[in-house]
């Protein structure tokens, strides 16, 4: 999906009111420095590509993050602010059914988080030069 | 240009109902979203109510479901609130606001439709009064 005709503003507003608090409440209890921030993104449309590669597939070491509060919110924004993005979701959704699996929080899908809580900050700050 | 107003408004004890009133123009009505905010005085801008004006789905804050009942009349563009049972803490500005996609993408809009900033236009408010 090409991500370049959503709306970041509301998708940013949607971030900053309740997913970002959500990616908080999946961390609480780890350090902020406990993770190195390795994942990074260029502009809006490929933060949101990132995203979504790290939200909705499964990685070595953490099956699946699909089912947390924050995914299915991030799911949502998209659907609403990405013009045809529910469109050609529907095949992985289906995937993704198949092979869901019961929810166990690793330190691997911590860090993963952490990397998404990156990305997601890059995301709100799109004229920051890349370091 | 957009505009959203609000009417209905009033003084009233408590116990009493209310009808509040959206009249909008300007954009294309059936593809809306349009919810129900309100203010008190020293408080932050609370969601009450939503509804799509592209399929009829409601939603509502759990402080006024079986008490607050929103409707729309895509006919006259216009979105309305009947307050029952009114209380004093209901007791604030009432503004309507619209959205865009957030109508026709209601299902998803749950996890949304309470949060202001998401909102593009909004009328004056109503100041509704709820006495002891």
């Known amino acids: 999906y090409d991500f370049t005709n959503c709306d970041f503003e509301k998708i940013k507003a949607a971030y900053l009111s309740t997913i970002s608090k959500d990616l908080i409440t999946y961390m609480s209890g780890t350090k902020s420095t406990e993770f190195n921030n390795t994942v990074s993104c260029s502009n809006r449309p490929h933060c949101l590509t990132e995203i979504q590669s790290l939200t909705f597939n499964p990685t070595a070491g953490c099956a699946s993050l699909a089912k947390e509060m924050f995914a299915m919110k991030t799911k949502a924004a998209l659907a609403i602010w990405c013009p045809g993005y529910s469109e050609t979701q529907i095949n992985a959704t289906q995937a993704m059914k198949k092979r869901r699996k019961r929810k166990v929080t690793t330190n691997k899908c911590l860090e993963q988080v952490s990397q998404l809580q990156g990305l997601w900050r890059r995301f709100n700050r799109p004229l920051l030069k890349q370091q | 240009q957009v505009q959203l107003v609000e009417s209905g408004g009033g003084l009233v004890q408590a116990g009493g109902s209310l009808r509040l009133s959206c009249a909008a123009s300007?954009?294309?009505?059936?593809?809306?979203?349009i919810t129900w905010f309100r203010q008190a005085p020293g408080k932050e801008r609370e969601g009450v109510a939503y509804?799509?004006?592209?399929?009829?789905?409601?939603y509502y804050a759990d402080s006024v479901k079986g008490r607050f009942t929103i409707s729309s009349d895509n006919a006259k563009n216009t979105v309305y609130l009947q307050m029952d049972s009114l209380k004093p803490e209901d007791t604030a500005v009432y503004y309507c606001?619209?959205?865009?996609?957030?109508?026709?993408?209601?299902?998803?809009?749950?996890?949304?439709?309470?949060?202001?900033?998401?909102?593009?236009?909004w009328g004056q408010g109503t100041q509704v009064t709820v006495s002891s």
């Open positions: 300007g954009f294309t009505f059936d593809d809306y979203a």
């Open positions: 509804i799509s004006n592209f399929d009829g789905m409601t």
């Open positions: 606001a619209a959205e865009g996609r957030m109508g026709t993408h209601s299902r998803d809009s749950v996890y949304f439709w309470a949060f202001s900033a998401l909102y593009d236009h």
